[in-house]
Structure formats: C-alpha cells, structure tokens
C-alpha cells in the first residue's frame, strides 16, 4: 500500500508516458490521475515500467474500477495482466476475441496460469459455447487446452469447431473427453472420402465404439500401432483376427512388439489360438483349440 | 530466476568517470528491460536509466547528458558509462531487471558510487 502523500510541484502527469518510469512510487501514487490512466491504457504497455510501479498503476485502476475493469480497459494491460489475481479477473466481463489474444499473447510460452484459467473460464461462459475460433486462438496458445476440460464443459463443443483441432491438441486427453469428442468428430467429418475422412478422424479414435472400427477395417485405412494402442479396450475386444488384421494392414506385424500391452494383451485372450496363428507372427495366448467360449455377459442380458 | 552481480563502482573525484558493469545469469532469456536505479543516503530509490530488449533506452533528466546506458546481449550484461560526476550522484546503484516470466522485479546486491574530493 503506497502512502497519500501530495504530488510535487510541476510533477502531476498531463500525459502516460516514459517519464512516469522515472518517478518514485509515491510520486506515481501522487501524481498520475487514475481516469487518464484508465483513458490511456494502451500507452502502459508500450512503456517498460517495473512491476513495482506496475502494482501502482494497478492499485489506481483498482479504486477507480471496484467492481471490475471495462474490456477498454482489460484489452490493453499488457504485462499489467500478469499482476491481476484470478480474484480480479472474475470481476471482468471478457466478450471480444481480440481482448483474449491480447492477454494470452502476454503469457506466451509459458504454462497456463491460474489468472489465464480463470480468464478462458470466463470468456468461453460469457460465450456460452467453445465456438471454432475461440478454440482455434486456445489451441494456437494452449495445445493441451481441450484436454484440460471436463467432458461436461467439452460437450459445449460444437461439432463445426472439431475442424481447429489438430492432433497434438489431443495429446493429453483421457479416454472419457475422447468419448465425448469422437461422435462430434464423426459428424464433423461426416462428408469426407475414405482416406481422408480416416486421416481427421484417426486422433479422435480413443472413443469410437466397435462397430465403428468394424466398419473402418473394411476400408484399408492401415491404422499405425500407436493409434491402435490408444482404441478403448472395450471396443477393440469383440474384432475378430480378420478385422483387426484388416484395420492395421501392413502395421499388423506391430502387434508382437505389443502382445503384453494392453488392449492388444486383452484381445489375445479373446481370440482362438488357430486364428491367431493365421496371422504368422507367434502370438500366444488366444483360446485353445476345442474349447468352448461362453459369452456371459450376453447370458445375463437374456436371463 | 535471474541472478545480478553488479561491479565498478568507488571513489570518484568531481567531474570524474566511472563504468559500472552488471552481469545476469540464470533465465536470462526471459528479460525483458533493464534497469538502473540509485539510492543516495538517506534517500530513497531513484530510477536512473533503463534499456529495452528492443534496444529502445532512456536516462532521468537528472543524469541526462552525462549517463550511458549500454546492454550487450551476447554476454548478459548491462553497462552504466558515468561521466562529470557530481557529489549527488553518490549513491549505491542498483541492477535490476524485469522478465517476461515472473510477474516481480529482480534486483543486484548493489555497487556504491562515491564522488568526493
């Protein structure tokens, strides 16, 4: 907290500019109007004040604005941002796609903070929805953004802004966001070709569902080792031998280097051992030959 | 972090010269401007001189004409060249510097100026 004391004569600021640098922080408490401050923000930024006297400028826009800074005001604070508490940001009021690249251009390189959270947080609710080039300016600052989302807040995603995503925006995602970011993803794509379609698509595979990879295998897509890793247990498990080795084409030889991981460990027990054997690349494991497999699951349901 | 380490300072007669010199270490790649600030006895601090990452500097109208401020990149270290040095020039003068990282200032440990006959 700066004292009140009385600004020196021929010392109070007409104009923000480079000689307030070489005040003394009372003499910025004292001598620089906090509305010609708030009219000339965007003169702040272009001047190298130390974060010192920058806790000074903030301290005034503080008592002027109590309930929060107008965007005028917000769009042009530049390191002044990296000041601001998360406590403060929630008072703001952040509409302009333009004010939230401003900001997050001031946090570049750097992990998202807590202030730049709560920023995001409140300008994607004042929003309503994760529109595509709100998402495509995250992505472009934050690649693990979408992954940092709860798949609630993901389901506000709409389909239209699956086209900013690239894969390493993926990267860090579980597979209970990728569920709910597959199915908009597919009909994101919906109208592409073949290959194509499979390229878009190939990220967003950690949720589709079996039949969904069934359909894939009849394609000849050659899905790589690691995107067949990444595929839920669950939905990789009722493939038959021919389907996953259609699913994988040439990748199919990957499968021995994986056979204790899982889902393809999973698989193998699932599988007869003759028809592992068709494969030629001395996968053990699968159901000996004679034996009977019950499917218990589909018994419960009947009964 | 950043780390500085100011050195050159000393006893000085009136109209006299001195370099002062302060080397970073640590994240220097993160600075963004530097600066030069002075603290006379008793008094408090006064901000001299600063240099930008952009290379855009400025000095106190009180120094103005008589101090230099220099920044070589390539060896992390700001230069303070002090000409016709007067007795309110002395003072202890600072190295500090403010990054793109950390939202505080970093500051050396100081080197006194003093200018007496």
């Known amino acids: 907290e700066v004292e009140k004391t009385a600004c020196p004569s021929g010392k109070k600021a007409r104009e923000i500019d480079e000689s307030l640098i070489f005040y003394k922080k009372w003499e910025l408490e004292a001598c620089v109007d906090a509305a010609l401050l708030a009219t000339q923000m965007d003169r702040v930024n272009a001047i190298p004040f130390t974060y010192e006297q920058l806790d000074v400028l903030k301290h005034k826009l503080d008592e002027l604005y109590p309930q929060g800074y107008p965007e005028s005001v917000i769009q042009h604070l530049g390191y002044l941002f990296l000041k601001m508490s998360p406590e403060d940001i929630r008072k703001w009021n952040v509409t302009s796609l333009e004010t939230l690249k401003a900001l997050l251009e001031v946090n570049k390189g750097h992990e998202m903070s807590p202030q730049v959270a709560t920023l995001i947080d409140r300008f994607v609710k004042g929003r309503g929805q994760l529109d595509k080039d709100t998402l495509d300016t995250l992505t472009a600052f934050y690649p693990g953004y979408l992954c940092s989302l709860s798949p609630e807040e993901l389901s506000s995603v709409p389909p239209s802004s699956i086209w900013a995503v690239r894969p390493q925006d993926l990267d860090t995602c579980d597979p209970r966001q990728l569920d709910v970011l597959y199915p908009k993803a597919r009909l994101a794509f919906q109208n592409m070709n073949g290959s194509e379609y499979f390229v878009k698509i190939q990220s967003f595979l950690g949720g589709a569902p079996t039949e969904d990879l069934k359909a894939l295998s009849q394609q000849n897509v050659s899905m790589d080792l690691a995107t067949f890793m990444k595929l839920r247990t669950d939905a990789v498990l009722p493939l038959t031998v021919a389907e996953v080795q259609k699913l994988l084409g040439p990748h199919v030889e990957g499968l021995k280097a994986e056979e204790r991981h899982r889902p393809v460990r999973d698989w193998i027990l699932r599988q007869r051992q003759d028809d592992l054997d068709t494969l030629g690349l001395g996968l053990q494991g699968g159901i000996p030959n004679g034996y009977l497999v019950l499917d218990l699951s589909m018994q419960e349901a009947l009964s | 972090e950043v780390q500085l380490v100011e050195s050159g300072g000393g006893l000085v007669q009136p109209g006299g010269s001195l370099r002062l010199s302060c080397a970073a270490s640590?994240?220097?790649?993160?600075?963004?401007?530097m600066y030069w600030v002075r603290q006379a006895p008793g008094k408090g601090l006064e901000w001299v001189s600063y240099?930008?990452?952009?290379?855009?500097?400025n000095v106190a109208d009180s120094v103005k004409g008589r101090f230099t401020i220099s920044r070589d990149n390539s060896k992390n270290t700001l230069y303070l060249q002090m000409n016709s040095l007067r007795a309110e020039d002395t003072a202890v003068y600072y190295c500090?510097?403010?990054?793109?990282?950390?939202?505080?200032?970093?500051w050396g440990q100081g080197t006194l100026v003093t200018v007496s006959s």
């Open positions: 500090s510097v403010r990054t793109t990282s950390y939202p505080v200032d970093f």
């Open positions: 640590g994240r220097t790649s993160t600075i963004d401007t």
């Open positions: 240099v930008t990452s952009r290379g855009t500097s």
